[in-house]
């Protein structure tokens, strides 16, 4: 899977969209999870309604909401009051029994609020010189990772 970058401004809301084949994933609940490390597990953040027919109803877990347009084939995740610690790699998933298919890999970047003059040193997003593979561009504010960029900040 390519990784799509979605950029949001700290303190504001960010909407992430994950398109999918509505027929292929018919009847399947969806989930939004956070990747723990480059090769680690994907930790569930929020999932759609337990009854697939009610997937259009927005479900919240803390400041993260999920809703699914099952006919149109678009899963939408909203991250409200975006914070620096929200930056990182996520996945949109289609659930089937105990299995999960990845619909899209998403890198969330948190940008400093231009109206906020506090120190933005703790805001992280990958620099142009960092490396990661498989990228294509999509805006919302979003883009895809440039070739050679990495989705996780370097660890010392």
């Amino acid at each position: 899977h390519n990784t799509t970058v979605f950029q949001g401004v700290a303190g504001q809301s960010l909407q992430v969209s994950c398109p999918y084949d509505s027929m292929k994933h018919w009847g399947r609940r969806k989930a939004w999870c956070r990747q723990l490390g480059e090769k680690g597990p994907c930790q569930r953040v929020v999932s759609t309604h337990n009854l697939w027919l009610l997937s259009f109803l927005r479900r919240w877990n803390g400041s993260t909401a999920i809703t699914d347009d099952t006919l149109g084939g678009t899963l939408t995740i909203t991250l409200r009051n975006l914070q620096p610690h929200d930056a990182g790699l996520y996945q949109c998933q289609s659930l089937h029994g105990s299995e999960a298919d990845t619909l899209r890999k998403v890198l969330v970047e948190v940008l400093a609020d231009p109206l906020d003059h506090r120190d933005a040193g703790d805001l992280w997003f990958p620099g142009e010189s960092e490396s990661f593979e498989d990228a294509h561009v999509e805006h919302s504010i979003s883009r895809s990772l440039l070739e050679g960029e990495i989705p996780f900040p370097p660890t010392s």
Partner: antibody
Framework: EVQLVQSGAEVKKPGESLKISCKGS????????IGWVRQMPGKGLEWMGI????????TYSPSFQGQVTISADKSISTAYLQWSSLKASDTAMYYC??????????????WGQGTMVTVSS | EIVMTQSPATLSVSPGERATLSCRAS??????LAWYQQKPGQAPRLLIY???TRATGIPARFSGSGSGTEFTLTISSLQSEDFAVYYC?????????FGGGTKVEIK
């Protein structure tokens, strides 16, 4: 009429290759999963694997992984089951079936007539 | 892999009587269970899906119940055309698996 029509019976020798087909009609072939089921003589049904012709996403049962290949050609609404080297134990009736999309899960609502494969030296 | 166990292996019933077939899953499959009927020389036919919903064209004498790990197919009054082999199948988790089948024969 919604139907799946399978290719005819085959008699093969051990070690030979084989590709049997399942052609769908009367519905949007690319929008439904297609499964393959084996039934050995006098035995029950065994789920082999499933494919989504829209993008050829395929899942195999561990029992059949590496033993067979499931594929599809959406341009001619046909799914395939193939062997590169047949064994006598592959002798069975093979069914393709369309997966009915449910609120959660998929049951096989339309079945092909079956293809009898006989492998004997 | 989820193991599906059907009982009894053979059920002898007189026409007009009630037949009760059981299917047990080795772990919960929620309500994702289907029942099929197969007659000699024919392909299987879907009877019940979602544990209790009758497929199109299936007579009302066929009913399914259960959820989780225990399921039942009931044929309220057996007709001559109902004597066949019945299979349950879970479609909750890959690989989807079938039970070994129950043969319903004339007593």
């Amino acid at each position: 009429e919604v139907q799946l029509v399978q290719s005819g019976a085959e008699v093969k020798k051990p070690g030979e290759s084989l590709k049997i087909s399942c052609k769908g009609s009367g519905y949007s072939f690319t929008s439904y999963w297609i499964g393959w089921v084996r039934q050995m003589p006098g035995k029950g049904l065994e789920w082999m694997g499933i494919i989504y012709p829209g993008d050829s996403d395929t899942t195999y049962s561990p029992s059949f992984q590496g033993q067979v290949t499931i594929s599809a050609d959406k341009s001619i609404s046909t799914a395939y089951l193939q062997w590169s080297s047949l064994k006598a134990s592959d002798t069975a009736m093979y069914y393709c079936a369309r997966a009915k999309m449910l609120d959660d899960g998929y049951a096989f609502d339309i079945w092909g007539q079956g293809t009898m494969v006989t492998v004997s030296s | 892999e989820i193991v599906m166990t059907q009982s009894p292996a053979t059920l002898s019933v007189s026409p007009g009587e009630r037949a009760t077939l059981s299917c047990r899953a080795s772990q919960s499959v929620s309500s994702n269970l289907a029942w099929y009927q197969q007659k000699p020389g024919q392909a299987p036919r879907l009877l019940i899906y979602g544990a209790s919903t009758r497929a199109t064209g299936i007579p009302a004498r066929f009913s399914g119940s259960g959820s989780g790990t225990e399921f039942t197919l009931t044929i309220s009054s057996l007709q001559s055309e109902d004597f066949a082999v019945y299979y349950c199948q879970q479609d909750d988790n890959y690989p989807y698996t079938f039970g070994g089948g129950t043969k319903v024969e004339i007593k």
